[in-house]
Amino acid sequence: SIPWNLERITPPRYRADEYQPPDGGSLVEVYLLDTSIQSDHREIEGRVMVTDFENVPEEDGTRFHRQASKCDSHGTHLAGVVSGRDAGVAKGASMRSLRVLNCQGKGTVSGTLIGLEFIRKSQLVQPVGPLVVLLPLAGGYSRVLNAACQRLARAGVVLVTAAGNFRDDACLYSPASAPEVITVGATNAQDQPVTLGTLGTNFGRCVDLFAPGEDIIGASSDCSTCFVSQSGTSQAAAHVAGIAAMMLSAEPELTLAELRQRLIHFSAKDVINEAWFPEDQRVLTPNLVAALPPSTHGAGWQLFCRTVWSAHSGPTRMATAVARCAPDEELLSCSSFSRSGKRRGERMEAQGGKLVCRAHNAFGGEGVYAIARCCLLPQANCSVHTAPPAEASMGTRVHCHQQGHVLTGCSSHWEVEDLGTHKPPVLRPRGQPNQCVGHREASIHASCCHAPGLECKVKEHGIPAPQEQVTVACEEGWTLTGCSALPGTSHVLGAYAVDNTCVVRSRDVSTTGSTSEGAVTAVAICCRSRHLAQASQELQ
């Protein structure tokens, strides 16, 4: 009888009577910043080392009674979820605990900062294998805490944190809002977001993925073999820390970017009921529940991509929003989205030696989002080719003219306010897949990449009648790199990638006449890397 949460994260091919996936994370050390722990609990005995680090505030209230088993409760449970002998995810992982939360579960930003510095110094003094840092805590947004997480992540440490239990936008909390941290929301046995009293799991664009976080059985500090159920995003984060330990033990050279992409890739897709989230957060919140990879090796051949949403631009006329990829990722395409439909498109531009995706609000618009498609593409050489607004009535077009470069994404950006309101749609001439087309008033940007063995193709799906949503997906073995709408449909709110599907959203069809302007075409650019496939075959 395996606890539901371990069954949920386990691919079917591991599911025997017992949960025993290959290699239990034995090459990885997981640091836990939490309460004190009961290190002699049978679940974690011999696998958790209690460091001498302690930085906690005084408990509130004069009548507070410090009871050891209560003080240890949260940390002991999480240590058990990560590496417990029976109810743990990564049974082979070794752990080190730092006490940054007091007996009431409260801590300070300064205590956490000093804890992170302690880990950094430990790493410098005695470098070991891959490190995972679990931060099962959330407080108000802190620029300084996010910066400390960024520094540690750039030193090669994987940080996993709880999204927070405030039924709120995770971007308002730290360290959940730090882009370098893997931020985890919580789901239950029905794959629904976890409700905790009147609150529940946080959500939004700062969440990377969800994981089991309700009624999670783990070590209880009540006795040395006791178990207890606990719930929250801390428990969810502990699952992902365990999965990360398993992945890193199988492939110790994985970078943070590679690990994050794999976590996303192997997650269960589209199983969460999004109706639980506020309407404006649904599109921003990833519908992903973490799972172990079906095989710990052989994922290297795939072209991994993820979608990164920017913060909202705000409603001012010239407002822009910027979405960025991680340092090790390539920006392969850029799109934009506005709930009001008033936007002036998007463009890829260089910023600090790296491409970013910038979306532009329009007059009267309520604001825009920029959506970056961020991919792992080793030895890539990517550039943006821009065509200014065309004079010809055929519209603007741009293609990848350099030898060996392929088109991975198209963006368009315009200066006029209501582009295309009374313009007929511009259709791409057939047989010219390697080019982007757009309105003559728009400048068009093509993302062109050269990488060994990279090949891409364009896939379109057009619907003549008005539809609120049109989608087109890449087939098995191909990865979505670009997602855009064919120009000419004035009521398009924008385009974005969800996993391997390109989604084009339009205004409520009841407000749109079914004229030719009602036609909506979603354009997906699907790529694969034969070079990566061959390299992985050589490794087998």
């Epitope: 417990g84 059985i217 073999t225 006791c226």
Partner: antibody, heavy 118, light 108 residues
């Protein structure tokens, strides 16, 4: 080899008291807790309490809280179970057993029979 | 408080037959469950610890399996000396030591 030898059982009057002894040998006395368990005739096993000889800490089954007192004499490697206000239903074989908390009761004494009767 | 339910209460078998005793915990206990054998007039003896590990000197015909809430003690081929009462046991917070009600394996 590890040995636990009980003594002190016998016939007791209702309302009376008695002290059982458990002499330990063959291992480091302070490294294992000692548990007292009893078994009424034809019945199952019932835990009474335990003592950690290292620090003298004790813990009791709620049911025996006011009836049983467990103590130790480290110089003699001996544990004691003092039972007061005995009644007919306390008639049982009393065992001592050793364990590390959370592990198994790996060695048991041979048991000593206590009969409460007038 | 954890409750351990053993079944059957009595098992009537002949020597050479296979005996299967189950122990169900009222809540999750991982693999931290032990099995003991008690012969008439003797103290209990540890057979299996941590659900599946044979104690020192215990013959290979005794095996334990299970985890979580459902556990099994199996005697592959009963010897005359195996007819006894078998108890499962776990640890809890209060009371810390919990025994099952016992299963008597008797000669048919």
């Amino acid at each position: 080899q590890v040995q636990l030898l009980e003594s002190g059982g016998g016939l007791v009057q209702p309302g009376g008291s008695l002290r059982l002894s458990c002499k330990a040998s063959g291992y480091t006395f302070s490294s294992y807790s000692i548990y007292w368990v009893r078994q009424a005739p034809g019945k199952g096993l019932e835990w009474i309490g335990w003592i950690d000889p290292g620090n003298g800490g004790t813990r009791y089954n709620q049911k025996f809280q006011s009836k049983a007192t467990i103590s130790r004499d480290n110089s003699k490697n001996t544990l004691y179970l003092q039972m007061n206000s005995l009644r007919a239903e306390d008639t049982a074989v009393y065992y001592c057993a050793r364990a590390r908390v959370g592990y198994s009761l790996d060695y048991w004494g041979q048991g000593t029979l206590v009969t409460v009767s007038s | 408080e954890i409750v351990l339910t053993q079944s059957p209460a009595t098992l009537s078998l002949s020597p050479g037959e296979r005996a299967t005793i189950t122990c169900r915990a009222s809540q999750y206990v991982g693999s931290y469950l032990n099995w003991y054998q008690q012969k008439p007039g003797q103290a209990p003896r540890l057979l299996i610890y941590d659900a599946s590990n044979r104690a020192t000197g215990i013959p290979a015909r005794f095996s334990g399996s299970g985890s979580g809430t459902d556990f099994t003690l199996t005697i592959s081929s009963l010897e005359p000396e195996d007819f006894a009462v078998y108890y499962c046991q776990v640890w809890d917070s209060s009371p810390p030591v919990v025994f099952g009600g016992g299963t008597k394996v008797e000669i048919k």
